[in-house]
Interface confidence: low
């Protein structure tokens, strides 16, 4: 039942004498394992015997394999799947049909495979893409319908007989679907490859030539051009003639149009291979080329730089940079169209030639105000000298110069005056637009550059102004030298260092912090009475009567200033003590009598002691001694003693007389 046998293998295999053939093959016998296999060469079915006749190249039975042809033919298969065969070496007479006779327990099958063995190695086949264009990458393929494990080969690419540098990728296939060896080469052909021969060479493992295939490359490219010019250096003078010729060295396909370009722009009505320029002008200087097109695109020649020589044109001056800041660097550039380029320059500043300046550029490293003005130049080349152009203006900017602060007032200035100052300067570029003053104050600027200080302070020492354009220039500070009456006048005790005691030597100093002018007079005053005109007031031996409120005055030509009143305090022991009696020195018994100890003391008495006519101290220590009720026995002389921090003082005796009351007398 034929439907039960399924085979897969290449339909035809190719080889040459002495090579080998590898036949990949698979099968499926559904009713069981293979029991017998015979490989026939050109089998033919014999109807009489119901068997196949032909040369048996290989045979295997249940009893085992039968060696045939000294192992030239090998069955590499198995009993149920693989039917791969190898013939090594293969001979010319192996060409024809191979018959695989397969038998299982119940089924038989003859499978036929074609074998084509040539006398010599057959050539590979080169495959090219349908169109090749310059600079576009293409893949060249070399295919050979042969591959065998026992016979290694190689494919090599040659261009005009020389091995190609590009790396080729070789692949082989030995499958039931196909058997081949393939080499692929990627490369980017140039226009110069057009018409060249490419060869794919088949070699054995040792590199020995076996066969080859060749193709001629058809590389499509834009026209390749050459330009020729007369005169050959393309340097002419105004009025001369110039001829340019365009030659096509290669074009595939043929060219269709011709044109000429100058500086990238097409020249009208110039559509031949020759360009004639008669009586050229300097405007015709530039880069020329010819352009020829074909179906691939336009091709351009190299550029020819036509130089039409002429004397320098009127020059202009470029300044980097104007306006310039004083002290900065400035560069002047003389610009003049000329061919050849000028070799010599003459520079002018405000119409006067600048000595030693012959270069295209003039560099001034440090600009000063006097550099300002008009700069012009003249350029010169081998054909002549140009004209002087209009020139360029250099504006040199600088801060205001020689700034001074000027006091407008008559001198001297007195405290409280209104002072007017002006800010003057010698020159400025750009113009002064504002002024600044130091120190800052809430002062008026009635007009630009004028400062008005109303009610000027005694301590306004110096003022400086700045005149400002883009920069500020400060003047040296000017001293206002404000005159004022003496300040901070005060009385200061020089001696003694501690408190003043009666009898001490005392010195008072009249101090002041400042005075302008310095020449001063002093006055001492107590209670409106003038005491002295020195800076010091001296007491050889101070008395309590000297205590009081003292002031000193200091005056100068501007005015006088008084100190605050200063209180002079004299400390002394209690004095002028006396005992006063109330209601009087004669009191009736039974009434009340108060004795008071009166004194003069600084500091006041802190402690009183009372004594009787026997100089006996009484147990009373307050200023008042109260006797209530008074008795006749209280009659007698009393005195008191006062004590302060300085010392003690005592009163004279004062007699108290206590007389009997009428009641007492009545009882007697």
């Amino acid at each position: 039942d034929s439907s039960k046998w399924v085979f897969e293998h290449p339909e035809t295999l190719y080889a040459w004498e002495g090579a080998c053939v590898w036949i990949p093959c698979t099968y499926r016998a559904l009713d069981g394992d293979l029991e017998s296999f015979i490989l026939f060469h050109n089998p033919e079915y014999n109807k009489n015997t119901s068997k196949f006749d032909g040369t048996r190249l290989y045979e295997s039975t249940k009893d085992g394999k039968v060696p045939s042809e000294q192992k030239r033919v090998q069955f590499l298969g198995d009993k149920n799947k693989n039917c791969t065969l190898s013939i090594h070496p293969v001979h010319l007479n192996d060409s024809g049909q191979l018959g695989l006779r397969m038998e299982s327990k119940t089924e038989k099958w003859m499978e036929r495979i074609h074998l084509n063995v040539s006398e010599r190695p057959f050539p590979p086949h080169i495959q090219l893409p349908p169109e090749i264009q310059e600079s576009q990458e293409v893949t060249l393929t070399c295919l050979l319908n042969f591959s065998c494990y026992g016979y290694p080969i190689q494919l090599q690419w040659l261009l005009e007989g020389v091995p190609m540098r590009q790396a080729a990728v070789t692949s082989t296939s030995l499958t039931i679907k196909s058997v081949f060896t393939r080499s692929e080469l990627k490369f980017s052909p140039q226009w110069s490859h057009h018409g060249k021969i490419v060869t794919c060479q088949l070699q054995d493992a040792d590199g020995k030539f076996l066969s080859n295939d060749t193709v001629q490359l058809n590389v499509k490219h834009t026209p390749k051009l050459e330009i020729k010019v007369t005169p050959s250096d393309a340097i002419v003078r105004e009025g001369d003639s110039v001829t340019m010729t365009c030659e096509v060295s290669s074009s595939n396909p043929e060219y269709t149009t011709v044109s000429w370009l100058k500086d990238g722009t097409s020249l009208k009505k110039q559509n031949t291979f020759t360009l004639n320029l008669r009586e050229v002008t300097k405007d015709q200087s530039g880069k020329y080329c010819c352009q020829v097109s074909n179906d691939v695109g336009p091709g351009r020649s190299e550029e020819v730089f036509l130089q039409v020589q002429y004397a320098p044109e009127p020059s202009t001056v470029q300044i980097l940079h104007s306006p310039a800041v004083e002290g900065s660097q400035v560069e002047f550039l003389c610009m003049s169209l000329a061919n050849p380029l000028p070799t010599n320059y003459t520079w002018y500043h405000n119409g006067k030639e600048m000595q030693g300046r012959t270069e295209e550029k003039v560099h001034i490293p440090k600009i000063l105000p006097w550099h300002a003005g008009t700069y012009s130049c003249v350029a010169e080349n081998i054909l002549g000298t140009g004209q002087r152009g209009p020139g360029a203006e250099l504006d040199v900017q600088y801060p205001p110069k020689k700034v001074t602060t000027v006091i407008q007032n008559p001198m001297p200035i007195r405290e409280g005056d209104t002072v007017t100052l002006s800010c003057n300067y010698n020159s400025s570029n750009p113009s002064v637009t504002r002024y600044e003053w130091k120190p800052h104050g809430a002062w008026e600027e009635p007009s630009l550059g004028v400062l008005k200080i109303q009610n000027v302070g005694w301590d306004n020492t110096t003022i400086a102004c700045a005149a400002c354009n883009s920069w500020c220039s400060w003047a040296s500070p000017v001293a206002l030298n404000v005159q004022y009456a003496p300040r901070d006048v005060r009385v200061r005790k020089i001696k003694p260092l501690s408190e003043i005691h009666s009898g001490n030597s005392v010195s008072l100093q009249c101090d002041f912090s400042s005075s302008h002018p310095k020449e001063v007079q002093f006055f001492w005053e107590k209670n409106g009475r003038l005491l002295g005109k020195e800076s010091q007031l001296n007491f050889d031996s101070i008395s309590p009567e000297d205590a009081g409120s003292y002031s000193c005055w200091v005056n100068n030509s501007i005015g006088q200033t008084a100190s605050k009143a200063w209180t002079l305090e004299v400390l002394y022991a209690p004095r002028r003590l006396r005992v006063s009696m109330s209601p009087g020195d004669q009191v009736m018994e039974g009434k009340s009598a108060t004795l008071t100890c009166e004194s003069d003391a600084n500091p006041p008495v802190s402690h009183y002691t009372w004594f009787d006519w026997n100089n006996q101290s009484l147990p009373y220590h307050s200023q008042k001694l109260r006797l209530e009720p008074v008795k006749v026995q209280h009659s007698g002389a009393y005195w008191c003693q006062g004590t302060n921090s300085v010392g003690k003082g005592r009163s004279p005796l004062s007699t108290l007389t206590v007389y009997y009351s009428p009641e007492t007398i009545g009882r007697r």
Epitope: R434, P439, H440, G441, A442, W443, D459, S470
Partner: antibody, heavy 116, light 108 residues
Framework: QVQLVQSGAEVKKPGASVKVSCKAS????????ISWVRQAPGQCLEWMGW????????SYAQKFQGRVTMTTDTSTGTAYMELRSLRSDDTAVYYC?????????WGQGTLVTVSS | EIVMTQSPATLSVSPGERATLSCRAS??????LAWYQQKPGQAPRLLIY???TRATGIPARFSGGGSGTEFTLTISSLQSEDFAVYYC??????????FGCGTKVEIK
């Protein structure tokens, strides 16, 4: 050295007034003006006005005209800024600065919070 | 009134990198421009006045430039203490002053 010391933080109700003081030392008070600048939380600096310590002349920002009064007391070297009819958006730190155009010396700032 | 516009509002920079802050005036203020630095909870600190003059005690890495209407503050190599808000202020119309709304320089 120059110092500007401002009064402490204040909490006010909407519609009330606040008076911030700025005591100057280390320089002649009369010779310089005082600028007032405020900064609401997370906001930009906002110039409010200027007063001359010399003659009391003032210049107020348009926004605060009629609501702000700036004064000085030359005897104590103190500048004052009073802001009336307070609103919640007046909550800010108020700075005084010695005004020379470029404020080199600033007070430490006074936080005024306006909240009902 | 002269309006001062600062850009960008926020600038993220790594320590050691250069920072350039811009300030534009709505009309020319000549060179009468100051730059301040303000850190949270502190009063502004003067960095630059006169557009390009460093105030006393300000490190040389801070530099100011420009005049007229376009100004820049450049911090050549940012230190950790430089991360703050920077304000420009014109005093061309002194005593009337106007401030920009600030550029916050933050750590990248």
């Amino acid at each position: 050295q120059v110092q500007l010391v401002q009064s402490g933080a204040e909490v006010k109700k909407p519609g009330a007034s606040v008076k911030v003081s700025c005591k100057a030392s280390g320089y002649t008070f009369n010779n310089y003006g005082i600028s007032w600048v405020r900064q609401a939380p997370g906001q930009c600096l906002e110039w409010m006005g200027w007063i001359s310590a010399y003659n009391g002349k003032t210049s107020y920002a348009q926004k605060f005209q009629g609501r702000v009064t700036m004064t000085t007391d030359t005897s104590t070297g103190t500048a004052y800024m009073e802001l009336r009819s307070l609103r919640s958006d007046d909550t800010a730190v108020y700075y005084c600065a010695r005004s020379t155009g470029d404020g080199e010396y600033w007070g430490q700032g006074t936080l005024v919070t306006v909240s009902s | 009134e002269i309006v001062m516009t600062q850009s960008p509002a926020t600038l993220s920079v790594s320590p050691g990198e250069r920072a350039t802050l811009s300030c534009r005036a709505s009309q020319s203020v000549s060179s009468n421009l100051a730059w301040y630095q303000q850190k949270p909870g502190q009063a502004p600190r003067l960095l630059i006045y006169g557009a390009s003059t460093r105030a006393t005690g300000i490190p040389a890495r801070f530099s100011g430039g420009g005049s007229g209407t376009e100004f820049t503050l450049t911090i050549s190599s940012l230190q950790s203490e430089d991360f703050a808000v920077y304000y420009c202020q014109q005093y061309h119309t002194w005593p009337v002053l106007t401030f920009g709304c600030g550029t916050k320089v933050e750590i990248k």
